[in-house]
């Protein structure tokens, strides 16, 4: 079950809930946002203060790390299995250091399996964080510091920090190095969403959340 099911069961307060893998008894803890846009959102990534190191291994990105109370990555394997069952939408919420907020909404999102390096698939972009997708299209394979699957001769994850769907290296990286205010410009290895804030701006906060399209 996911946060949408939990919401529909009557638990409509945002917080940490135990989710289960599809067709399995395996459990995972996640933050459920029951407030934004009608609720039912499973948060798969959150950055807010730099308290968690996002330069992690393939295994850690597969299984998840951090704390759902703060900064965390839910885990590629769970997200892949979940989004392979039904059609999901992806909402990405962004905050800059000047108090502005923006979002990108994709009307269809799924991750391929590990055998395809958790390649991201996205369609139907709307929102205020750029008219062009800052996640390269068509989707790229996921790369980490110990698993280089990008389209660059270089190793984007090693160079730019964090696991992400790097292209060469691509116009985004929400898992980049966290830079505090006044140190967040001209930082190519920061938390980047190019088509909102440009080439070298590192964001203050990000949230990636998913929900069934038919919610």
């Amino acid at each position: 079950r996911d946060c949408a099911e939990i919401f529909k069961s009557g638990l409509t307060t945002s917080g940490i809930y135990t989710l289960t893998f599809p067709n399995s008894t395996e459990e995972i803890k996640a933050y459920c946002d029951m407030d934004v846009g009608g609720g039912g959102w499973t948060v798969i990534q959150h950055r807010e203060d730099g308290s968690v190191d996002f330069q992690r291994t393939w295994k850690e990105y597969k299984e998840g790390f951090g704390s759902p109370l703060g900064e965390y990555w839910l885990g590629n394997e769970f997200v892949s299995q979940l989004t392979g069952q039904h059609r999901y939408v992806l909402k990405i919420q962004l905050k800059d250091w000047e108090g502005n907020e923006a979002h990108s909404l994709y009307d269809h999102f799924y991750l391929a399996g590990e055998e395809s390096n958790y390649r991201i698939h996205l369609t139907g972009l709307t929102g205020t964080a750029g008219k062009i997708s800052s996640i390269s299209q068509p989707g790229s394979d996921f790369s980490t510091k110990d698993s280089d699957n990008d389209k660059c001769i270089c190793k984007c994850s090693q160079m730019l920090s964090g696991g992400w769907w790097f292209d060469a290296c691509g116009p985004s990286n929400l898992n980049g190095q966290y830079y505090p205010q006044k140190q967040n410009t001209n930082k190519f290895n920061g938390i980047k969403w190019y088509y909102w804030k440009g080439s070298g701006y590192s964001l203050k906060a990000t949230t990636m959340m998913i929900r069934p399209a038919d919610f």
């Epitope: 062009i132 389209k151 660059c152 001769i153 270089c154 984007c156 090693q158 160079m159 730019l160 292209d167 060469a168 290296c169 691509g170 116009p171 001209n186 930082k187 190519f188 440009g198 080439s199 070298g200």
Partner: antibody, heavy 122, light 107 residues
């Protein structure tokens, strides 16, 4: 095979203008930041300018700011450098350069053209 | 602007020698440094990026190290084709700047 072919160099008088072109092939041009680097005769390398994949972000060395303009046409796989108000100190071989990544704020050049010579003299 | 200072400006060496070239930045550039090789009349060639990452196709006798302000390019066993001029370049901040070059000559 990646190829970068510059053209447009030549002899020009001080105060004059030139437009350099760089035809790119062998890679997905629209996915990479592109740069111009120059080298005066017998001297070292000097970075001139870089442009983002979309062309929306451009940066210049102080020595050419306000005089040179970098641009690109992704439909033609071509990079340009417009040189105006040329000075004797602009005399150099101008290299078209493919960046290792698409990150305009981090220039590592992994492929270079053969260079085109610009001579500014009266 | 960040100034990049290479030393020595030239070095005489023999085939088989170990050659070390240093590059110093005027301020902290973390690991955002590249090394290039240039032969007379030719375009430069990328050897090392991000201080120590070997560019694809470059022989393993070339290696880079350092971070912050002090960097080193080492050629472990000099080959005849390695006689050239070597440049460092910082990629930390605009404007991107090169060192003055180190010419490796035949002794």
């Amino acid at each position: 095979e990646v190829q970068l072919l510059e053209s447009g160099g030549g002899l020009v008088q001080p105060g004059g203008s030139l437009r350099l072109s760089c035809a790119a092939s062998g890679f997905t041009f629209r996915k990479y930041a592109m740069s111009w680097v120059r080298q005066a005769p017998g001297k070292g390398l000097e970075w001139v300018s870089v442009i983002s994949v979309s062309g929306g972000n451009t940066y210049y060395a102080d020595s050419v700011k306000g005089r040179f303009t970098i641009s690109r046409d992704n439909s033609k796989n071509t990079l340009y450098l417009q040189l105006n108000s040329l000075r004797a100190e602009d005399t150099a071989v101008y290299y078209c350069a493919k960046d290792l990544t698409d990150i305009v704020l981090m220039v590592y050049v992994d492929y270079w053209g053969q260079g085109t010579l610009v001579t500014v003299s009266s | 602007d960040i100034q990049m200072t290479q030393s020595p400006s030239s070095v005489s060496a023999s085939v088989g020698d170990r050659v070390t070239i240093t590059c110093r930045a005027s301020q902290d550039i973390d690991r955002w440094l590249a090394w290039y090789q240039q032969k007379p009349g030719k375009a430069p060639k990328l050897l090392i990026y991000a201080a120590s990452s070997l560019q694809s196709g470059v022989p393993s006798r070339f290696s880079g190290s350092g971070s912050g302000t002090d960097f080193t390019l080492t050629i472990s066993t000099l080959q005849p084709e390695d006689f050239a001029t070597y440049y460092c370049q910082q990629a930390n901040s605009l404007p991107f700047t090169f060192g003055g070059g180190t010419k490796v000559e035949i002794k």
